[in-house]
């Protein structure tokens, strides 16, 4: 399954929108900084097959979409930017979904890398718990916004590797 070029463009658009969503200076939130343990090894496109990489990408985007679809998120961000950002993520999910469905239909498809899926899920658990502990404060959301920009950048790199594999 070949991810369309528009998928990468969508990812870049999502990153731009996320950058625009920043409301407060990151420097005023330095005390709230947190290491969420982004599982960078899961974004090494050389370590597993394309099908597995697409499943990991899908999980990453789906968890990001869910995170920014909560009521707490709606209260934290400018509505029109949040809606545009969610729309970009949704489009990416559709592209990735079509790819995964295509691969699921092929009997020779290897088992999915369940530990990679779990690593992504645990990463977002840490983010969720951080927001809960910080009571969804503006600075907590700013820290999370910066972190998601970082994770989306990693997923953009993974997509580049995947396209080279085509």
């Amino acid at each position: 399954c070949d991810l369309p070029q528009t998928h990468s463009l969508g990812n870049r658009r999502a990153l731009i929108l996320l950058a625009q969503m920043g409301r407060i200076s990151p420097f005023s939130c330095l005390k709230d900084r947190h290491d969420f343990g982004l599982p960078q090894e899961e974004f090494d496109g050389n370590q597993f097959q394309k099908t597995q990489a697409i499943s990991v990408l899908h999980e990453m985007i789906q968890q990001t979409f869910n995170l920014f679809s909560t009521e707490d998120s709606s209260a934290a961000w400018e509505q029109s930017l949040l809606e545009k950002f969610s729309t970009e993520l949704y489009q990416q999910l559709n592209n990735l979904e079509a790819c995964v469905i295509q691969e699921v239909g092929m009997e020779e498809t290897p088992l999915m890398n369940e530990d990679s899926i779990l690593a992504v899920r645990k990463y977002f658990q840490r983010i969720t718990l951080y927001l809960t502990e910080k009571k969804y404060s503006p600075c907590a959301w700013e820290v999370v916004r910066a972190e998601i920009m970082r994770s989306l950048s990693f997923s953009t790199n993974l997509q580049k590797i995947l396209r080279r594999k085509d």
Epitope: Q62, N66, S69, V100, I101, V104, R121, Q125, T128, T132
Partner: antibody, heavy 119, light 108 residues
């Protein structure tokens, strides 16, 4: 509000298969993995596996690999769990439970479906 | 597979008393992925505590959780009649996800 409604009780003979359904409502069906957990009479809870309704990928517990098949129908927001080669030890209440994160992990359960395997 | 062992298997106490339920993991479990559920006869399990010590929505403050590594505890500070049920600890730190065998809390 989130609701998971399961199909009714089943009685099956050893060696047969059973297919239990779980219809979801009150949230975007494709956004959350759905899990299956079973409970034999008077026993504890046992995780069987999960399915991502968005694309249909599954992760099964090794114990059930080869005997369990989880599928979904996005048009009806329903997930299915089929267990084959049934034996008496498979007599249990089967639950679907929605995944999520933080306080949403297994916060929503179906009412359970009793499957009885008896000759 | 991470085996969760709960103790005691049965705990007999009276309303108003303090209940302490233990969950011991066969290997270390990150506290973020350790949960507690309550189950009453004929009902589905109900989420009580997530990530070791956080109270789920609608759960009374008399319930609390603690622990780390391989030892986790659920405490009910003063038992109410509706608290008598079976309690399960659960981990999703690694596949396959597992549950403890349960602790039955019964009226003395």
């Amino acid at each position: 509000q989130v609701q998971l409604v399961q199909s009714g009780a089943e009685v099956k003979k050893p060696g047969a298969s059973v297919k239990v359904s779980c219809k979801a409502s009150g949230y975007t069906f494709t956004n959350y993995w759905m899990h299956w957990v079973r409970q034999a009479p008077g026993q504890g809870l046992e995780w069987m596996g999960e399915i991502n309704p968005s694309h249909g990928r599954t992760i099964y517990a090794q114990k059930f690999q080869g005997r369990v098949t989880m599928t979904r129908d996005t048009s009806t927001s329903t997930v299915y769990m089929e267990l084959s080669s049934l034996r008496s030890e498979d007599t249990a209440v089967y639950y679907c439970a929605r995944g999520g994160l933080g306080p949403a992990w297994f916060a929503y359960w179906g009412q359970g479906t009793l499957v009885t395997v008896s000759s | 597979e991470i085996v969760l062992t709960q103790s005691p298997a049965t705990l007999s106490l009276s309303p108003g008393e303090r209940a302490t339920l233990s969950c011991s993991a066969g290997s270390s479990v990150d506290s973020s992925y350790l949960y507690w559920y309550q189950q009453k006869p004929g009902q589905a399990p109900r989420l009580l505590i997530y990530s070791t010590s956080n109270l789920a929505s609608g759960i009374p403050a008399r319930f609390s959780g603690s622990g780390s590594g391989t030892d986790f505890t659920l405490t009910i500070s003063s038992l109410e009649p509706e608290d008598f049920a079976v309690y399960y600890c659960h981990q999703w730190s690694s596949y396959p996800f597992t549950f403890g065998q349960g602790t039955k809390l019964e009226i003395k």
